[in-house]
Interface confidence: low
């Protein structure tokens, strides 16, 4: 008995071939011997089966001795043994129809779980293997679960159902709702304008929700809400903003915040959360601000950084075009009695400069000693 696998909602074509390459009488029946369709001369006739309005054949093939049964908009309950009677012969075809669906919305938040459920006909024992867009294979029986979805899981999941050594393939598009970056760090000199951007890793027709940026300044004992906002059809409107600092927010996506001045008291870490309408859970993006200040006070040239710097970062003070005078894995370095010239304060990681601030040291004129 030939086995054919079909997909719920699809169309399947069951073949039936006569040895004579001409149009002869044929009938398709189900396992209960109920006629589905056949021919009467060059006309298609239909029987009283439940498939009536979904069954068809290809009359253009009859002259070649081919009498297919076409079933449209397949249902799981169409799974059956179909019998083609032609030339006093019976050809049996077992049709097994499967369906694969995501048990929830196909738009899921990063970190959530995806469950795929297989609908299968009674008596079948299929196995399912799914391959995620990043190439991860998962397998199971009637259900497959993937916990902790990641951004790379966005895209087309290819699932193969195996039954009787036959395969049928399903493709399910999954959108993982997340920010493009989980974390970012901005390095700024004191006084510079700071731009924070929070691009989303997905696009949807309508995007509605609300968000907030909480900020933990390095110098502060507790975090505070810097700004809250609403998102309606991709339009951003500010609900509440602190007076210090007074952030500005762009009116369109991507979410964009401007801090007028980078100051040591603002250096620290923030967490932008975005709650989307009709979704449980929130999207998160961490943002870090490192601020540098170079100052000269009397005979002391000092360079300091504030904010979340790694212990492997190097802070250096050097006179332009000369070797570094001081270079330490510290958040503050200084030079006593610096010579005149343009000094550079550098924050670097493995030789790559992350932040640079220049300060000019003027010559000090000593009073001539009287003879």
């Amino acid at each position: 008995k030939k086995v054919v696998l079909g997909k719920k909602g699809d169309t399947v074509e069951l073949t039936c071939t006569a040895s004579q390459k001409k149009s002869i009488q044929f009938h398709w029946k189900n396992s209960n011997q109920i006629k589905i369709l056949g021919n009467q001369g060059s006309f298609l006739t239909k029987g009283p089966s439940k498939l009536n309005d979904r069954a068809d054949s290809r009359r253009s093939l009859w002259d070649q001795g081919n009498f297919p049964l076409i079933i449209k908009n397949l249902k799981i309950e169409d799974s059956d043994t179909y019998i083609c009677e032609v030339e006093d012969q019976k050809e049996e075809v077992q049709l097994l129809v499967f369906g694969l669906t995501a048990n929830s919305d196909t738009h899921l938040l990063q970190g959530q779980s995806l469950t795929l459920t297989l609908e299968s006909p009674p008596g079948s024992s299929p196995s399912v293997q799914c391959r995620s867009p990043r190439g991860k294979n998962i397998q199971g029986g009637k259900t497959l679960s993937v916990s902790q979805l990641e951004l790379q899981d966005s895209g087309t999941w290819t699932c193969t159902v195996l039954q009787n050594q036959k395969k049928v393939e399903f493709k399910i598009d999954i959108v993982v709702l997340a920010f493009q970056k989980a974390s970012s760090i901005v390095y700024k000199k004191e006084g510079e304008q700071v731009e924070f951007s929070f691009p989303l890793a997905f696009t949807v027709e309508k995007l509605t929700g609300s968000g907030e940026l909480w900020w933990q300044a390095e110098r502060a004992s507790s975090s505070k809400s810097w700004i809250t906002f609403d998102l309606k059809n991709k339009e951003v409107s500010v609900k509440r903003v602190t007076q210090d600092p007074k952030l500005q927010m762009g009116k369109k996506l991507p979410l964009h915040l401007t801090l007028p001045q980078a100051l040591p008291q603002y250096a620290g870490s923030g967490n932008l959360t975005l709650a989307l309408e009709a979704k449980t859970g929130k999207l998160h993006q961490e943002v870090n601000l490192v601020v540098m200040r170079a100052t000269q006070l009397q005979k002391n040239l000092t360079c300091e950084v504030w904010g979340p710097t790694s212990p492997k970062l190097m802070l250096s003070l050097k006179l332009e075009n000369k070797e570094a005078k001081v270079s330490k894995r510290e958040k503050a370095v200084w030079v006593l009695n610096p010579e005149a010239g343009m000094w550079q304060c550098l924050l670097s990681d493995s030789g790559q400069v992350l932040l640079e601030s220049n300060i000019k040291v003027l010559p000090t004129w000593s009073t001539p000693v009287q003879p």
Epitope: S127, P133, G135
Partner: antibody, heavy 118, light 113 residues
């Protein structure tokens, strides 16, 4: 039945880069990942990495991290594999293969011979 | 990475006789939840790309003659050519695809005695 057609043989000097193309025809380009496998003269098969032409996602073997880059052009149904900082031991036949849903390779390109010689 | 070791390195068999190639993996490639062995066998003739013969350790790929069969489970696998034909002269490779990176055996050369 999908077919994979690769670009022609290349001769390169040590330190140079090579970019091999793999064009899919006769099937849906984005349905399967494409893996790259190389074979040095008289040697066995070595997996280099894969790319999902649909999403652009890639995964590289640790040995080739930093030297290999896989890209795709969906408009021409072509996947590219670029290997940089070539050395003599990179002399090999480079194959692209359709990475089946399970991870076996039912369809292979004809292979591209890359010779690295000073 | 999983290491695949084939034996023997080469094999000479008379036409019509049985040829057996073994493949051992450094760790199991059997998925217990799926009850499938993630192992494939390939045939490679000179100047040609490899050709998939067997997947899931024992399932013949489309168009592969039934004289080729695969068996084994866990870490030990066998490719059998029940009656060697002249066109079967080639190098045969096993490959695991249970984990990334997928890895191949070193190959077994089959010749006619």
């Amino acid at each position: 039945q999908v077919q994979l057609v690769q670009s022609g043989a290349e001769v390169k000097k040590p330190g140079a880069s090579v970019k091999v193309s793999c064009k899919a025809s006769g099937g849906t380009f984005s349905n399967y990942a494409i893996s790259w496998v190389r074979q040095a003269p008289g040697q066995g098969l070595e997996w280099m990495g894969w790319m999902n032409p649909n999403s652009g996602n890639t995964g590289y073997a640790q040995k080739f991290q930093g030297r290999v880059t896989m890209t795709r052009d969906t408009s021409t149904s072509t996947v590219y594999m670029e290997l940089s900082s070539l050395r003599s031991e990179d002399t090999a036949v480079y194959y692209c293969a359709r990475d089946d849903d399970y991870g076996d390779y039912p369809v292979w390109g004809q292979g591209t011979t890359v010779t690295v010689s000073s | 990475d999983i290491v695949m070791t084939q034996s023997p390195d080469s094999l000479a068999v008379s036409l019509g006789e049985r040829a057996t190639i073994n493949c051992k993996s450094s760790q199991s490639v059997l998925s217990t939840s799926y009850n499938k062995n993630y192992l494939a066998w390939y045939q490679q003739k000179p100047g040609q790309p490899p050709k998939l013969l067997i997947y899931w350790a024992s399932t013949r790929a489309s168009g592969v003659p039934d004289r080729f069969s695969g068996s084994g489970s866990g870490t030990d696998f066998t490719l059998t050519i029940s009656s060697l034909q002249a066109e079967d002269v080639a190098v045969y490779y096993c490959q695991q695809y249970y984990t990334t990176p997928p890895t191949f055996g070193q190959g077994t050369k089959v010749e006619i005695k």
